[in-house]
């Protein structure tokens, strides 16, 4: 027989990594092998995620917790606790239907995952490019050509060259 | 190193009392290690005594033989789990186990102790 | 739940197969451990839900069955195999965790 203290509703009694069997008197029975109640009273024990193919076990199932998954190398995840696994892409390029595309000119994308986005535009900001974008790198805006007027540098001048051997004083 | 250890066995009179303790050290009880208590009288099989649900709650699983004479306890700060046996009868000599059930090994029993006798005896 | 198993006991030679069964009183799906216990020595665990192997036990040994029906099977008895084999429901509850009676397998 099983005993529990407490005269409340005998369900309510059964902690986590257990279920309310109805069909054995509502006893608290542990959760079989591979699955788990990751709360008390529950009614069943859910069966366990397993990760396989593509992806890979984070974290094991326990009595009171689900497995976690996440991504092969070469795959990233995507959704909410990692639903789905979607190819890594190089720096450059974006996920298409038809696998990875480098990005167009004018679009840049610095991650292995995602899509390729426009370059900044500078004058939108009143400034002018300071280096240009490529399919890795966002543009780098400087000063507005304004700042750039016969006497401004945009460059900061060398320091001053020291004499071999000297130490700063 | 992971183990269970068994004490407080000995002689002990019918109608006596002995409360026995399992140690554990290794790993903590919770809700995929249950402690369990089985025994084995000379000369013959293994016997189901019961187990207590291994985290916080008070849930224990007994066999029907044991009729409320046999209790079976828990301390966490300890990590160590009790068998308390009442109106002892010479039926109860036996080698007593401690033994860990595991969700992992489908609630087998993974892990034992070495065991601590009992005889009971006028 | 009743556990039965048989034979109580066998007589074998290494190199022999050997089957043991184990029959509950009631279903208890695949909730079914096996043990080997030697004289003097606490028991090990062989084989856990029916039929999975555990850690460290040599692929000699196999389990299978589901419900009420359960086999053991060593392939190629060897040496050390010579003991006392046991069957357990891990089905809790209800008197629900209760040994099989044991098969003693000895040298022929």
């Known amino acids: 027989f099983e005993r529990t203290r407490s005269l409340q509703d005998p369900c309510s009694n059964c902690p986590a990594g257990t279920f309310c069997d109805n069909n054995r008197n509502q006893i608290c029975s542990p959760c079989p092998p591979n699955s788990f109640s990751s709360a008390g009273g529950q009614r069943t024990c859910d069966i366990c995620r397993q990760c396989k193919g593509v992806f890979r076990t984070r974290k094991e199932c326990s009595s009171t917790s689900n497995a976690e998954c996440d991504c092969t190398p070469g795959f990233h995840c995507l959704g909410a606790g990692c639903s789905m696994c979607e190819q890594d892409c190089k720096q450059g390029q974006e996920l298409t239907k038809k696998g990875c595309k480098d990005c167009c000119f004018g679009t840049f994308n610095d991650q292995k995952r995602g899509i390729c986005r426009p370059w900044t535009n500078c004058s939108l900001d009143g400034k002018s490019v300071l280096v240009n974008g490529t399919k890795e790198r966002d543009v780098v805006c400087g000063p507005s050509p304004a700042d750039l007027s016969p006497g401004a540098s945009s460059v900061t001048p060398p320091a001053p060259a020291r004499e071999p051997g000297h130490s700063p004083q | 190193e992971v183990q269970l250890v068994e004490s407080g066995g000995g002689r002990v009179q019918p109608g006596g009392s002995l409360r026995l303790s399992c140690a554990a050290s290794g790993f903590s009880f919770s809700a995929n290690y249950y402690p369990c208590w089985v025994r084995q009288a000379p000369g013959k099989g293994l016997e189901w005594i019961g187990c207590i649900y291994g985290g916080s709650s008070d849930i224990t699983y007994d066999a029907n033989w044991t009729k409320g004479r046999f209790t079976i306890s828990r301390d966490n700060s300890k990590n160590t789990v009790y068998l308390q046996m009442n109106s002892l009868r010479a039926e109860d000599t036996a080698t007593y186990y401690c033994?860990?059930?595991?969700?992992?090994?489908?609630?087998?029993?993974?892990?034992w102790g070495q065991g601590t006798q009992v005889t009971v005896s006028s | 739940i009743q556990m039965t198993q048989s034979p109580s006991s066998l007589s074998a030679s290494v190199g022999d197969r050997v089957t043991i069964t184990c029959q509950a009183s009631q279903s208890i799906s695949n909730r079914l451990a096996w043990y080997q216990q030697k004289p003097g020595k606490a028991p090990k665990l062989l084989i856990y839900s029916a039929s999975t192997l555990a850690s460290g036990v040599p692929s000699r040994f196999s389990g299978s069955g589901s419900g009420t029906d359960f086999t053991l099977t060593i392939s190629s008895l060897q040496p050390e195999d010579f003991a006392t084999y046991y069957c357990q429901s891990t089905y809790y509850g209800n008197d629900g965790n209760a040994f099989g009676t044991g098969t003693k397998v000895t040298v022929l």
């Open positions: 033994a860990r059930s595991a969700w992992y090994s489908g609630w087998g029993g993974d892990l």
